[in-house]
Amino acid sequence: CKAMHVAQPAVVLASSRGIASFVCEYASPGKATEVRVTVLRQADSQVTEVCAATYMMGNELTFLDDSICTGTSSGNQVNLTIQGLRAMDTGLYICKVELMYPPPYYLGIGNGTQIYVIDPEPCPDSDF
């Protein structure tokens, strides 16, 4: 297993609609034809997988239909969007990149992006 540098922003604030986007960039040694991207969430020392996608270089990322993630790729950058976030989902979201093919296998894990989610205040009743 070869190590690979992965960069991602330190902090991202989710929108009022619970959507957060960030870029995951990996220092590719070349042009992998098959890349796997996984988003992990770390909170309270527990790590869980949020979503994952394997893509062929030059093609779009395809997450499972029920995934809360969408994304696009451009060269050695992956633009990730996580939807449906609520305040309780605030945490450190780690980008993991694997060069699956051709060999050798490369693995890179970012330092994580702290995503802050603030639930919107309910609108006050209006007397119109």
Epitope: P29, G30, A32, G75, L99, P102, P103, P104
Partner: antibody, heavy 118, light 107 residues
């Protein structure tokens, strides 16, 4: 740590075939990566000749394609270059080097000088 | 093939000063650019890959930047061992190609 070492005759006559071998230690060439030849004429820049892959695939620089053959011997963990119909312009230091597919060259041999002269 | 053009051909800089080397690609190569240092009688040594990432063991005074067709290698404070020839290299498209080199000499 991977090491690459070129070997072959230092003098080749015009119209003959240049043959070089690169011995690899510290990594099994059948496990991955692409194994390249690069040359550098005296006082000039670097020219990529081509690669042979861990899987036997190859790609040669179109400018040399008609004269180049590369092969791999996994039992000896080495790969080879043959360049036919050489002329004086093929005089150069020849390097073997390793890269990831369509990647930068992370490991190089020390180079071997080949002179084409009668 | 993609032509990599380096400038200047020779750069004279005093030790301790900053050196800026340029490389232009004839077409978009994204960030698939590497830089190598070569000293007389030696093989090229990788310095930078993927435009801006230092190869293992390379001092922080070496940095790379750019994207698309314009790339730069910067050496922030030249040491005596930095005087050498520097090559840029594109690995976006086969055939892989190199610039013609920039010779960095002592002023």
């Amino acid at each position: 740590q991977v090491q690459l070492q070129e070997s072959g005759p230092g003098l080749v006559k015009p119209s003959q075939t240049l043959s070089l071998t690169c011995a690899v230690s510290g990594y099994s060439i059948s496990s991955g990566y692409y194994w390249n030849w690069i040359r550098q004429p005296p006082g000039k820049g670097l020219e990529w000749i081509g690669y042979i892959g861990y899987d036997g695939s190859n790609y040669y620089n179109p400018s040399l394609k008609s004269r180049v053959t590369m092969s791999v011997d996994t039992s000896k963990n080495q790969f080879s270059l043959k360049l036919s119909s050489v002329t004086a312009v093929d005089t150069a230091v020849y390097y073997c080097a390793r890269n990831y597919y369509s990647g930068y060259f992370d490991s190089w041999g020390q180079g071997t000088t080949v002179t084409v002269s009668s | 093939e993609i032509v990599m053009t380096q400038s200047p051909a020779t750069l004279s800089v005093s030790p301790g000063e900053r050196a800026t080397l340029s490389c232009r690609a004839s077409q978009n190569v994204g960030t698939y650019v590497a830089w190598y240092q070569q000293k007389p009688g030696q093989a090229p040594r990788p310095l930078i890959y993927s435009t801006s990432y230092r190869y293992s063991g390379i001092p922080a005074r070496f940095s790379g930047s750019g994207s698309g067709t314009e790339f730069t290698l910067t050496i922030s404070s030249l040491q005596s061992e930095d005087f050498a020839v520097y090559y840029c290299h594109q690995y976006d498209t086969y055939p892989l190609t190199f610039g013609q080199g920039t010779k960095l000499e002592i002023k």
